[in-house]
C-alpha cells in the first residue's frame, strides 16, 4: 500500500468543509522520488493540496474542501502514472443533515388486532442513514413519573409507523411515548404524547342494512328510507355517537351529514330526501362520550326513497272525429307544478255517470300524451288524472262543449328563421282565457294525428312563436283556437314555411323558329313543389361568339321569347334562368346559329 | 365505592312469573352497559342478559329469549329482570353485573337466589 | 355459538407452586378473554380483562397472555387465598360464554 488517506470526519453536515491527508511512504520505489499528490473529488480534480516531505521521507499532501456539497462522494489521492491518473488511496465522504424532530405523532389502538398504531411524519430528508425507534413507558399517572419501560419498537425500513402489541399494553393506564431519530450528525425526539391506549380506539363502523318491511308497520314517506344498522360486536358495549352520510348516487351532490345518532338507535328513518331517488348511505361511530377515533366510513348501503304521487297541472285540448263526433281525441300536457313534480307513470281518462255514484268508467289508460276514445252520448265531461305508485294527481276536468265564443281575427305568420315561425292574431272581445295553437305539415302531408299543440295561459297575447318541430322547405298549417270560461272560439288556420326553397331547376329552352337576326325560343314551366316558393321571373341570356351579353327579364307566366337583332350566320350561346323570393337556377345552355344571308327562314 | 344490590328472588311455581331488581350505586349508572348472569347449584356461570347503557339494545342467552325480558330505569340507577314461563332448570342465583368497555363484569352484585319447583 | 374449553377442570396445588390454566375458544376472539375468581358462597370477581391486562386490585402474580383461541391463566406463586374456581368469558360476540370452570385445591 503506497498511500493512505486520512479525513477530519467522514460525515459531515452538508456545505461544511472537510479536510484530507494524504501520505505516500517512502519505500514505493518505483515512484517518481519528488511525486506529485493530485487530488480528486467524484471524477473532479481538486486544485489546492498543500505538499511537503516529511522527516522520514514520506511524501504528505493537505486538501481542504471549503464545501461539501456533495451527499455522497469518493475522494481519491492519485499521482501522475505516465498517461494515466493512478489512484492510491479513496474514502466515501457522505453529507447531510443531523435528524429533524419527528412530528404529528399519533395513534390508534385497534382491538382487533390488539395493538397500538402510532404513526409520524419524519420531517425532511437527511440524505443519511436515519433510524427511528418509538419508545414508550407505562405511567401510572399523567407521565411525569416513568413506569415499568416498554420494548422498543423498531419500524420496517422507510416506514413511519409502528405497532405496539398487546402484550406491551395496559388499558385504562397512560402510557408515555415518542418517537426517537437518529443518525451520525445527531439524534432528535418527538413531543412525548401521554395516553391511554383505549382513548385512542379506532372501532370498525357498524354494518348498514335496509329495513324490512312489516306488514303492520306504515310504509316509509315520500322521500323518507328506512335502514337499520348492526353494531360492530366487538364494540358493543362501548358507548358510542355515530353519524351518518347520504347523496343521491346520481349527478354531483356532495355528501350530506346527520348526526349525532347514538349507536343503539339501530334503526332510523330519514326523511327530506328526493322522492324516488336512489341514494348511497354510509354510517361511522366514534367512542363517545370517552375519548376516542372515528371509525371508517362503513361499505355502502344503497336505497331508494319512495316517490310521491304527481304535482302537475294537465294542459288540455280536444278534438272530435267530422264522421263520428262522439269519438275524441283527448291531448294533454303536464305541466310541474313543484320542482319535483313526482314521476309519472301513466295517465287515466275515466267518467263518472250522473246517479250512480262511486262509479268510475274508465274510458283509457296510456302512457302516451293523447288517446282517442268514444264518449258516451249522455257524457259531457271526463276527468284526466296522472299516476304513479304513489297515488295520482289532482283530477283535470274535460268539459265537451259547442264553440260558442267570438272568433280571433287577422291570423297570420312569419318565418323568424328556419326553425321557427312567428304566429300572430287580433284578440276577440272579450278576451279569451287562453289559446291553443296547433301546428303540422300542410297539404299534401297534412295529418291530424301529427300536429303539436301549445297551450298559451294568456289571454291578452297577440301571438306565440312556434319553436318546436318546425323545419325548413316544409309548408306548415296553423290553428289557433281561442278558449273561454265554457266554451271555445271557432278555430282559424293559416299556411307558411319558415324557410322556402330557390327553384330546383330551370325549364329547358328549345328553338321554335329561327332566322337570319331573330330567333324564337321556347320552354315548358316546372310544375310548383311543396316548401318551394312560386317563380317572381325568367331572365333569358344570351352571349354571341365575341362573347358580347345581353339579357332580358320576362315575366313568371312566360312560356317563350323571340331574340331580336342578331347577326346572321352567327354562333349564340343561351340560357334561361327561374328566380323566386328564395332563389334563382340557371337551365342548361343552348346554342344555335342564325341563319346565313342567303338563306331562307326556318319555321 | 360500587354498589349492586339484587332483590326479588324467591320461590315460584313452574310457570310462573318474577321481576328481579338491581340497585346499582357509587358509578355514574346511565354511562354503563349491565347484565345478568346466574349460576345454578354447584354449576358454572351462565350469561343470561345485559343492556345498553341507554336500553336500545338487550341480548338474551337462547335458553331466555321471548320468556325473559331485561330493562333498566336510568332515572331510578336500577336494573331490571322480568322472567316468565319459569322452568325448573332457571333455578340459579342471579348476579347483576356491570359491564365494561370490553365486555368483562367489572363489578357484581352478591346475587339472589330464584327457585323453580312445585 | 362461541364454546369455551377450560382445562383442566380442576388440580391440586401447593402454596407456591405456579399454576397455569388453559381457555380455548370454538372460533377466534382476538384479544376479548377475561379471567375471573369465584370463592364458595361469594360473586365472582375480575382478574383479568382483554386477556393480559391486570384489573385494579388484584395481585401481579396473576398473568394472562395469548389471543385468538389459545389464552392462559398464569399464577406464579400460589397463594392460600388463591383457592378457588377459575373461570374463563369471552365478550367479543354474542352471545356472552363463560368456560366450564377450573377448581383449584389445596394439594
Known amino acids: 500500500e503506497c498511500g493512505h488517506i486520512s479525513v477530519s470526519a467522514p460525515i459531515v453536515h452538508l456545505g461544511d468543509p472537510i479536510t484530507a491527508s494524504c501520505i505516500i511512504k517512502q519505500n514505493c520505489s518505483h515512484l517518481d522520488p519528488e511525486p506529485q499528490i493530485l487530488w480528486r473529488l467524484g471524477a473532479e480534480l481538486q486544485p489546492g493540496g498543500r505538499q511537503q516531505r516529511l522527516s522520514d521521507g514520506t511524501q504528505e499532501s493537505i486538501i481542504t474542501l471549503p464545501h461539501l456539497n456533495h451527499t455522497q462522494a469518493f475522494l481519491s489521492c492519485c499521482l501522475n502514472w505516465g498517461n494515466s491518473l493512478q489512484i492510491l488511496d479513496q474514502v466515501e465522504l457522505r453529507a447531510g443533515y443531523p435528524p429533524a424532530i419527528p412530528h404529528n405523532l399519533s395513534c390508534l389502538m385497534n382491538l382487533t388486532t390488539s395493538s397500538l398504531i402510532c404513526q409520524w411524519e419524519p420531517g425532511p430528508e437527511t440524505h443519511l442513514p436515519t433510524s427511528f425507534t418509538l419508545k414508550s413507558f407505562k405511567s401510572r399517572g399523567n407521565c411525569q413519573t416513568q413506569g415499568d419501560s416498554i420494548l422498543d419498537c423498531v419500524p420496517k425500513d422507510g416506514q413511519s409507523h409502528c405497532c405496539i402489541p398487546r402484550k406491551h399494553l395496559l388499558l385504562y393506564q397512560n402510557m408515555g411515548i415518542w418517537v426517537q431519530a437518529e443518525n451520525a450528525l445527531g439524534t432528535s425526539m418527538s413531543p412525548q404524547l401521554c395516553l391511554d391506549p383505549m382513548d385512542v380506539v379506532k372501532l370498525e363502523p357498524p354494518m348498514l342494512r335496509t329495513m324490512d318491511p312489516s306488514p303492520e308497520a306504515a310504509p316509509p314517506q315520500a322521500g323518507c328510507l328506512q335502514l337499520c344498522w348492526e353494531p360492530w360486536q366487538p364494540g358493543l358495549h362501548i358507548n358510542q355517537k355515530c353519524e351518518l352520510r347520504h347523496k343521491p348516487q346520481r349527478g354531483e351532490a356532495s355528501w350530506a351529514l346527520v348526526g349525532p345518532l347514538p349507536l343503539e338507535a339501530l334503526q332510523y328513518e330519514l326523511c327530506g330526501l328526493l322522492p324516488a331517488t336512489a341514494y348511497t348511505l354510509q354510517i361511522r361511530c366514534i367512542r363517545w362520550p370517552l375519548p376516542g377515533h372515528w371509525s371508517d366510513w362503513s361499505p355502502s348501503l344503497e336505497l331508494r326513497t319512495t316517490e310521491r304521487a304527481p304535482t302537475v297541472r294537465l294542459d288540455t285540448w280536444w278534438r272530435q272525429r267530422q264522421l263520428d263526433p262522439r269519438t275524441v281525441q283527448l291531448f294533454w300536457k303536464p305541466v310541474p307544478l313543484e320542482e319535483d313534480s313526482g314521476r309519472i307513470q301513466g295517465y287515466v281518462v275515466s267518467w263518472r255517470p250522473s246517479g250512480q255514484a262511486g262509479a268510475i268508467l274508465p274510458l283509457c289508460n296510456t302512457t302516451e300524451l293523447s288517446c282517442t276514445f268514444h264518449l258516451p252520448s249522455e257524457a259531457q265531461e271526463v276527468a284526466l288524472v296522472a299516476y304513479n305508485s304513489a297515488g295520482t294527481s289532482r283530477p283535470t276536468p274535460v268539459v265537451f262543449s259547442e264553440s260558442r265564443g267570438p272568433a280571433l281575427t287577422r291570423l297570420h305568420a312569419m318565418a323568424r328563421d328556419p326553425h321557427s315561425l312567428w304566429v300572430g292574431w287580433e284578440p276577440p272581445n272579450p278576451w279569451p282565457q287562453g289559446y291553443v295553437i296547433e301546428w303540422g305539415l300542410g297539404p299534401p302531408s297534412a295529418s291530424n294525428s301529427n300536429k303539436t299543440w301549445r297551450m298559451e295561459q294568456n289571454g291578452r297575447a297577440t301571438g306565440f312563436l312556434l319553436k318546436e318541430n318546425i323545419r325548413p322547405f316544409q309548408l306548415y298549417e296553423i290553428i289557433v283556437t281561442p278558449l273561454y270560461q265554457d266554451t271555445m272560439g271557432p278555430s282559424q288556420h293559416v299556411y307558411a314555411y319558415s324557410q322556402e326553397m330557390a327553384p330546383s331547376h330551370a325549364p329547358e329552352l328549345h328553338l321554335k323558329h329561327i332566322g337570319k337576326t331573330w330567333a324564337q325560343l321556347e320552354w315548358v314551366p316546372e310544375p310548383p313543389e311543396l316548401g318551394k316558393s312560386p317563380l317572381t321571373h325568367y331572365t333569358i341570356f344570351w352571349t354571341n361568339a365575341q362573347n358580347q351579353s345581353f339579357s332580358a327579364i320576362l315575366n313568371a307566366s312566360s312560356r317563350g321569347f323571340v331574340l331580336h337583332g342578331l347577326e346572321p350566320a352567327s354562333l349564340y350561346h343561351i340560357h334561361l334562368m327561374a328566380a323566386s323570393q328564395a332563389g334563382a337556377t340557371n337551365s342548361t345552355v343552348l346554342t344555335l346559329m342564325t341563319l346565313t344571308p342567303e338563306g331562307s327562314e326556318l319555321h | 365505592e360500587v354498589q349492586l344490590l339484587e332483590s326479588g328472588g324467591g320461590l315460584v311455581q313452574p310457570g310462573g312469573s318474577l321481576r328481579l331488581s338491581c340497585a346499582a350505586s357509587g358509578f355514574t349508572f346511565s354511562l354503563y352497559w349491565m347484565g345478568w348472569v346466574r349460576q345454578a347449584p354447584g354449576k358454572g356461570l351462565e350469561w343470561v342478559s345485559s343492556?345498553?347503557?341507554?336500553?336500545?339494545?338487550?341480548p338474551y342467552a337462547d335458553s331466555v329469549k321471548g320468556r325473559f325480558t331485561i330493562s333498566r330505569d336510568n332515572s331510578k340507577n336500577t336494573l331490571y329482570l322480568q322472567m316468565n314461563s319459569l322452568r325448573a332448570e332457571d333455578t340459579a342465583v342471579y348476579y347483576c353485573a356491570k359491564l365494561g368497555e370490553l365486555g368483562m363484569f367489572l363489578e357484581w352484585g352478591q346475587g339472589t337466589l330464584v327457585t323453580v319447583s312445585s | 355459538d362461541i364454546q369455551m374449553t377450560q382445562s383442566p377442570s380442576s388440580l391440586s396445588a401447593s402454596v407456591g407452586d405456579r399454576v397455569t390454566i388453559t381457555c380455548r375458544a370454538s372460533?377466534?376472539?382476538?384479544?376479548?378473554l377475561n379471567w375471573y375468581q369465584q370463592k364458595p358462597g361469594k360473586a365472582p370477581k375480575l382478574l383479568i380483562y382483554y386477556a393480559s391486562n391486570l384489573q385494579n386490585g388484584v395481585p401481579s402474580r396473576f398473568s394472562g397472555s395469548g389471543s385468538g383461541t389459545d389464552f392462559t391463566l398464569t399464577i406464579s406463586s400460589l397463594q392460600p387465598e388463591d383457592f378457588a374456581t377459575y373461570y374463563c368469558q369471552q365478550s367479543m360476540w354474542m352471545p356472552m360464554g363463560f368456560g366450564g370452570g377450573t377448581k383449584v385445591e389445596i394439594k
Open positions: 343492556i345498553s347503557s341507554s336500553g336500545g339494545v338487550t
Open positions: 372460533q377466534g376472539i382476538s384479544s376479548y
